[in-house]
């Protein structure tokens, strides 16, 4: 059951099912927008972020997003509707617990990105091939 | 009438680890729309936010207490406990446990009757 | 962290009279925030979320307001069983956290 107060004043968008039909409750996120990182040539890396937000819809996952050009390399996190494109690109890996980096085209720069659906998963971006989801194996193992 | 009720120890002494269990009654722990936790308060200051839950999701606690924290649950039971190791003096409070709905996480509708914990030798 | 300060840090007022109590944020908490009632020996009882939704069994009276990093509670015409402190809370980054509260005491 749905606490009272809570059913007669949250608005109806706020009841959020996936395709399980499971309700999905707000998320709590790494969201530091883009700020400098050190991260480089690492199977993983931890986001040094350390703010922790509650995101506005229960639709929203986490999102982490690793750039490197001849200048500097950045990291940005956020909460994100994963019906909407985020920097052009469709967040493909939103329903995954962890946040599994993917190489991105982008001129001048090499852009990774990932997106995951549980609490603070963009505090640990990955970056290692053994997590590569094309294999049927480890989509059990991730998805347990 | 769903309600929850802190229950401990109300002496501890320095150094070692405070444990307290919440008994919940008039609903299941397990119902994921309800957010679980524990919050305290020094005697005569403010409320200061321990950690919280829901069934199926991840504990988070409040990076002030350097992991010195330890939520876990007890379906069978119907309850969840707070074990809080290294105690000083400062971890003397007032502790509530606490319930709220998980579809606006952070807000607590129901209270325990807090239970006092005081930490001395 | 971000840091709830409210203010007055005493509110001396009569009976029917009308009580504004202020919480400023450190930085935008969005609409996410709470104001709780504590009486002494009690435990807080949840009274307004996310600045402005009153809580189940909340009289008319109470009421909040603001967005972003101020915040106002007003009781509109002060109870008997008003006189206690009140706490704002913040849920937009976590931990939450709790402003230092305001006593509203009979003058």
């Known amino acids: 059951t749905i606490p009272p107060h809570v059913q007669k004043s949250v608005n109806n968008d706020m009841i959020v099912t996936d395709n399980n039909g499971a309700v999905k409750f707000p998320q709590l996120c790494k969201f530091c927008d883009v700020r400098f990182s050190t991260c480089d040539n690492q199977k993983s890396c931890m986001s040094n972020c350390s703010i922790t937000s509650i995101c506005e819809k229960p639709q929203e996952v986490c999102v982490a997003v690793w750039r490197k050009n001849d200048e500097n390399i950045t990291l940005e996190t956020v909460c994100h509707d994963p019906k909407l494109p985020y920097h052009d690109f469709i967040l493909e890996d939103a329903a995954s617990p962890k946040c599994i980096m993917k190489e991105k085209k982008k001129p001048g720069e090499t852009f990774f990105m990932c997106s995951c659906s549980s609490d603070e998963c963009n505090d640990n971006i990955i970056f290692s091939e053994e997590y590569n989801t094309s294999n049927p194996d480890l989509l059990l193992v991730i998805f347990q | 009438q769903l309600q929850v009720q802190e229950s401990g120890p109300g002496l501890v002494k320095p150094s070692e680890t405070l444990s307290l269990t919440c008994t919940v009654s008039g609903g299941s722990i397990s119902n994921a729309y309800f957010s679980w936790g524990w919050i305290r308060q020094p005697p005569g200051k403010g409320l200061e936010w321990i950690g919280s839950?829901?069934?199926?999701?991840?504990?988070y606690y409040n990076p002030s207490l350097k992991s010195r924290a330890t939520i876990s649950i007890d379906t069978s039971k119907n309850q969840f406990s707070l074990k809080l190791s290294s105690v000083t003096a400062a971890d003397t409070a007032v502790y509530y446990c606490?319930?709220?709905?998980?579809?606006?996480?952070?807000?607590?509708?129901?209270w325990g009757q807090g239970t006092l914990v005081t930490v001395s030798s | 962290e971000i840091v709830l300060t409210q203010s007055p840090a005493t509110l001396s007022l009569s009976p029917g009279e009308r009580a504004t109590l202020s919480c400023r944020a450190s930085?935008?908490?969005?609409?996410?925030l709470a104001w709780y009632q504590q009486k002494p020996g009690q435990a807080p009882r949840l009274l307004i979320y996310d600045a402005s939704n009153r809580a189940t069994g909340i009289p008319a009276r109470f009421s909040g307001s603001g967005s972003g990093t101020d915040f106002t509670l007003t009781i509109s015409s002060l109870e008997p069983e008003d006189f206690a402190v009140y706490y704002c809370?913040?849920?937009?980054?976590?931990?939450?956290?709790f402003g230092q509260g305001t006593k509203v005491e009979i003058k």
């Open positions: 809370q913040q849920r937009s980054n976590w931990p939450p956290t």
């Open positions: 839950f829901y069934y199926g999701g991840k504990t």
């Open positions: 930085q935008s908490v969005r609409s996410y």
């Open positions: 606490a319930r709220g709905p998980t579809l606006i996480r952070g807000v607590i509708d129901s």
